[in-house]
Structures are given as C-alpha cells and as structure tokens.
C-alpha cells in the first residue's frame, strides 16, 4: 500500500488517543530496557509500511497480534486516514482469520510489540518531539502541511 | 524563515578528518530527520546517511560507515557530520538537507572539502 | 538496494520545447520518489514530491506521473532558467539513493 496519500496528522492524533495507550497495555509488566529495537524508518509514510508490515503480517514466533486491541484500532485509523486503504486489506484480514485463537503472549510478541512502540515513536514528530522544545516552532513552517 | 546553514570550505591533508556544521532555524529541530548527501566533482548525488535529532539515532550506508560520524548539538539546533581518515576520493561537496516525509525540502547551501596534499 | 535508472543522460532542447525525463526503479516503490534541479554551484532545489504532487512555488509547467515503477518529469514548455540537471529520489526505505541525473543544455 501506498501510504505516501495518509493524512499523517490525524494518525498522530488517533495514535495518541487510544493505540499509544493499548500497545503500552499489552507490554504491561516488561521494561522498555527489556528489548533492543532492531526495527526502523526513516520518514513517515515508511514508518508507516514498517508498521503495518509489523501488525498486521504474521510471522511463525508470533501469529496473533492482528487480532490484539491496538492492531484493530491500527486498521481502524488506517482505513480511515489513509484513501483507498481498507480496499487493500482483504488478504490481510484472511490471515487474521487463520491466526491463532489463543490468548499466550509470547515473548516474541512482546518483542515485535516493542518495536512497534518504537516504530511509533519515530511516526510521531510533530506533537510529542515538540513539548518542552526550546527549539522554534512551526508557525512559519509552511513545508510542514502542505501536502494535505 | 526556514533556514540550513552550513560552514565554510575545508582543504584538508589525506589521513585528517574534517568536522561540517549545519545550523537549522526557522523549524522545530527534532520533527524533521537530518540527511547528508555527496556530490563529487562533475558527479550526481549520493545519499551517505541520515540522524534523527531527537535521539541520535544515525543510519549510514555501508561505504560510509568507517568514515562517517553524524552528531546533533540539540541546544544549538545544529546538525554536524564528521570526516575521518580522508582521502582524495573524499573531495567533493557535501550537503545537509531535512526531511519529514522522505523529500528535501530544505537544503544547506552545500560546504566543499578538498583533501590535498 | 533498490536502483534508480534515470535517462536520457544529457539532452539538448531549445526554449519552449516539450522535455520528459524518466526515472525507472529496481522495485516497486509506489509513490515514494521527488524530483530535483540543481543548477552550476548551487543546491537542489525541490520540484515534485510523492511522485506527482508540485513543491510550492514551483511553475506550473513542471509536473511529475507514475506507471509502475516508472516515474516521469515533464517540462511542458521549456524555459531559459530550466536549463539546469535533474535528479530523482527514492525514498522507500532505506539506503535512498538518487537517479543519475539528466543534464538539459541548449539547442
């Protein structure tokens, strides 16, 4: 999928609200120190791909995280801010039939959580990078939202 | 107004290395990723790495990665990327540029490094 | 890697001329690719974004398409002051790389 059309603020926004706190929920109980991010991007329509490819691809160590609360919220904010999104997911939602019905959290999980978290983290530049900034703020910025 | 100013034109002998700043203004510094690109005498561009102000997390492509160092001063809104061990080859000029969305939509006016003997 | 393979090289074209220069890539890179003018001692300068979305303040004359992992410039009618090289740039991940430019000269 394309995600280069994604209205980026608003994912910010709906990731903020309610993804951010059900990821932090799923890792309830390991520190953050507990996994190396091995898992990057390096602008936001690529953290994105990364993201999706994380949540919603299964692998043989970890085959359930499509079905968790923060994937569905995933695919919600993504078929909602993201053109022509949803109409990509048909395969994607198939494979989450297939997925394991257990609820183990293996380790493995926990581990592709943590680098979603950080996947996440990298997404998110304009809100939280810029509470208690003493650098200059995007007010003149206007490279910053143009192309929405 | 958006803003990236680098410093001025190095002559360096080989095995030196060579420090290049790149002050941002204008913008918040660490909402955009910070990206280094090469241009070689009469060449095209090459895409040496990037760091992310943030937090400093650098990604550098292979042939960079034992010549190249990528710094941010988060105080001074300053970017640096660090030259070790040069050579001739490494003559050329080099450009800072942000990114948000993975074009450039700002660049440095470009710093040239001569490495002469 | 993914490659980009940009051609032609070189052109020549006179003022008011129609100029398309194409960008292919190794891979499927959906949109993820701008396009650039660099001028003698200068910095690129910024033109088309996302494949086909025009940078501000760029003319009109300038516009950017896809098919595949084709990408294309399209200068519609050229001007004096586009007579400059032109780069692509992917940005699929990374190592990004560039094109090899296109050098547009007069006629």
């Known amino acids: 999928y394309d995600f280069t059309n994604c209205d980026f603020q608003k994912i910010e926004a709906d990731y903020l609200r309610t993804i951010s706190k059900d990821l932090i929920t799923y890792m309830s109980g390991t520190k953050s120190t507990d996994f190396n991010n091995t898992v990057s991007c390096s602008n936001r329509p690529h953290c994105l791909t990364e993201i999706q490819s994380l949540t919603f691809n299964p692998t043989p160590r970890c085959a359930s995280l499509a079905k968790e609360m923060f994937a569905r919220k995933t695919k919600a904010t993504l078929a909602l801010w993201c053109p022509g999104y949803s109409e990509t997911q048909i395969n994607a939602t198939q494979a989450m039939k297939k997925a394991r019905k257990s609820k183990v959290t293996t380790n493995k999980c926990l581990e592709q959580v943590s680098q979603l978290l950080g996947l996440w983290r990298r997404f998110i530049r304009t809100l939280l990078k810029q509470q208690g900034s003493s650098d200059y703020k995007d007010d003149d910025d206007k490279h910053h939202h143009h192309h929405h | 107004e958006v803003q990236l100013v680098q410093s001025g034109a190095e002559v360096k002998k080989p095995g030196a290395s060579v420090k290049v700043s790149c002050k941002a203004s204008g913008y918040t510094f660490t909402t955009y990723w910070m990206h280094w690109v090469k241009q070689a005498p009469g060449q095209g561009l090459e895409w040496m790495g990037m760091i992310d102000p943030s937090d400093s997390e650098t990604t550098l492509i292979q042939k960079f990665k034992d010549k190249v160092t990528l710094t941010v001063d988060k105080s001074t809104s300053t970017a640096y990327m660090e030259l070790s061990s040069l050579r001739s080859e490494d003559t050329a000029v080099y450009y800072c540029?942000?990114?948000?969305?993975?074009?450039?939509?700002?660049w440095g006016q470009g710093t040239t490094v001569t490495v002469s003997s | 890697d993914i490659q980009m393979t940009q051609s032609p090289s070189s052109l020549s074209a006179s003022v008011g001329d129609r100029v398309t220069i194409t960008c292919r890539a190794s891979e499927n890179i959906y949109s993820y690719l701008a396009w650039y003018q660099q001028k003698p001692g200068k910095s690129p300068q910024l033109l088309v974004y996302?494949?086909?979305t025009l940078a501000e303040g760029v003319p009109s004359r300038f516009s950017g398409s896809v098919s595949g992992t084709q990408f294309t410039l399209t200068i519609s009618s050229l001007q004096p002051e586009d007579f400059a090289t032109y780069y692509c740039q992917h940005h699929y991940g990374t190592p990004w790389t560039f094109g090899g430019g296109t050098k547009v000269e007069i006629k």
């Open positions: 996302f494949a086909k």
């Open positions: 540029a942000r990114t948000l969305d993975g074009y450039y939509d700002y």
